[in-house]
């Protein structure tokens, strides 16, 4: 089952997904898509990094934190209600059957009426388990577990309030992390 | 125009071996996953065998496995399928297929028959 | 492996008429499911792939739904080119495997 994650039409929904990479600089090439994850690649790209930077991208889908650290957490701009569905974050490990593949389930709720100068915003998550990936065969793909529930909540949706903000390392503290090597 | 050509089918003995071939053209061939899929006489459609753009990551289905050998070669836009130790079930319709997870272009197929 | 199984085996349809086939997977396969058309001596065509986009020059007259372990194609009115067989794929799952086909004859 997909761990699922809420916005409101109008606000940036944020889709947390993190690895270690082995070294510094020592990237591995990450693929977002909507839809999920398939066997092979992601379906529906959206944003696409390589081993040295993000390669492709379509309007309103970026990465707001430092991919170059492994934060590849995707930042939808501006929901609308036809963003709601499935998203695949893949982290594209060299190896045989090696990927780690994370399906991740967007709700978007419509706008809340009563206006107000800030708008709180409910993230309800339940983390993959911390994994130290090793070389493994198509009959031994694994199934990741998954931690209780944690509930945050985000003041601001501003973009880089997000950036600056403990959201992020709130989340890789959490264990939503993919140690390589 | 995406064309997909496969060649290198005929009757071989049980125990043989044969190498298909496919010429890609008309798509950026280093870009995509390919594959082989096959279909015996009377069946229906089984993939076989997969590679990666670089040809780092080689997938085949378990009845081939130790047996089939896919490779490619970018420079020729071309993909193989290394076929050993054939058997009668192997004789089926050859296609080579752009690789999108789906298989959104195939060739017209190379017919392999394995008889004695 | 992830075991698809259409129905029915054979289907006998008026020109003009609407086919429904459908696809059953033995485990989940999420919208990670397409379609092919298969006439003699051609090659297969993609018809349609996560679950309902339709492939480029695909008529609209196809459409595919469902997701997790059910799906359909509906063909909405029959053409005399459509008599062919069809088979649905799955990706989501390592093997990828195929149904075993529908065969959409003239009645």
């Known amino acids: 089952s997909e761990v699922e994650y809420r916005a409101e039409v109008g606000q940036n929904a944020y889709l947390p997904c993190f690895y270690t990479p082995a070294a510094p600089g020592n990237l591995v090439p990450v693929c977002w898509g909507k839809g999920a994850c398939p066997v092979f690649e992601c379906g529906n790209v959206v944003l696409r990094t390589d081993e040295r930077d993000v390669n492709y991208w379509t309007s309103r889908y970026w990465l707001n934190g430092d991919f170059r650290k492994g934060d590849v957490s995707l930042t939808i701009e501006n929901v609308t209600l036809a963003d709601s569905g499935i998203y695949c974050c893949r982290i594209q490990i060299p190896g045989i059957m090696n990927d780690e593949k994370f399906n991740l389930k967007l709700v978007i709720k419509p706008a809340k009426v009563t206006p107000a100068p800030t708008r709180q915003r409910d993230f309800t998550a339940a983390f993959p388990r911390m994994l130290t990936t090793r070389g493994h065969g198509p009959a031994e793909t694994q199934t990741l577990g998954s931690l209780p529930d944690i509930n945050l909540t985000q003041i601001s949706t501003l973009a880089n309030e997000l950036r600056d903000s403990r959201l992020a390392n709130d989340l890789r503290d959490s264990g939503a992390t993919i140690r390589i090597g | 125009e995406v064309q997909l050509v496969e060649s290198g089918g005929g009757l071989v003995q049980p125990g043989g071996s044969l190498r298909l071939s496919c010429a890609a053209s008309g798509f950026t061939f280093s870009s995509y996953w390919m594959s082989w899929v096959r279909q015996a006489p009377g069946k229906g459609l089984e993939w076989v065998a997969n590679?990666?753009?670089?040809?780092?990551?080689?997938y085949y289905v378990d009845s081939v496995k130790g047996r089939f050998t896919i490779s490619r070669d970018s420079a020729k836009n071309s993909l193989y399928l290394q076929m050993n130790s054939l058997r009668a079930e192997d004789t089926a319709m050859y296609f080579c297929?752009?690789?999108?997870?789906?298989?959104?272009?195939w060739g017209q197929g190379t017919l392999v028959t394995v008889s004695s | 492996e992830t075991v698809m199984t259409q129905s029915p085996a054979t289907l006998s349809v008026s020109p003009g008429e609407r086919a429904t086939l459908s696809c059953r997977a033995s485990?989940?396969?999420?919208?990670?499911l397409a379609w092919y058309q298969r006439k003699p001596g051609q090659a297969p065509r993609l018809l349609i792939y996560f679950s309902s986009t339709r492939a480029t020059g695909i008529p609209a007259r196809f459409s595919g739904s469902g997701s997790g372990t059910e799906f359909t194609l509906t063909i909405s009115s029959l053409q005399s080119e459509d008599f062919a067989v069809y088979y649905c794929?799955?990706?989501?799952?390592?093997?990828?495997?195929f149904g075993g086909g529908t065969k959409v004859e003239i009645k």
């Open positions: 297929a752009r690789d999108s997870n789906f298989f959104d272009y």
């Open positions: 590679i990666k753009q670089d040809g780092s990551e080689k």
């Open positions: 485990q989940s396969v999420s919208s990670n």
């Open positions: 794929q799955q990706y989501n799952n390592w093997p990828l495997t």
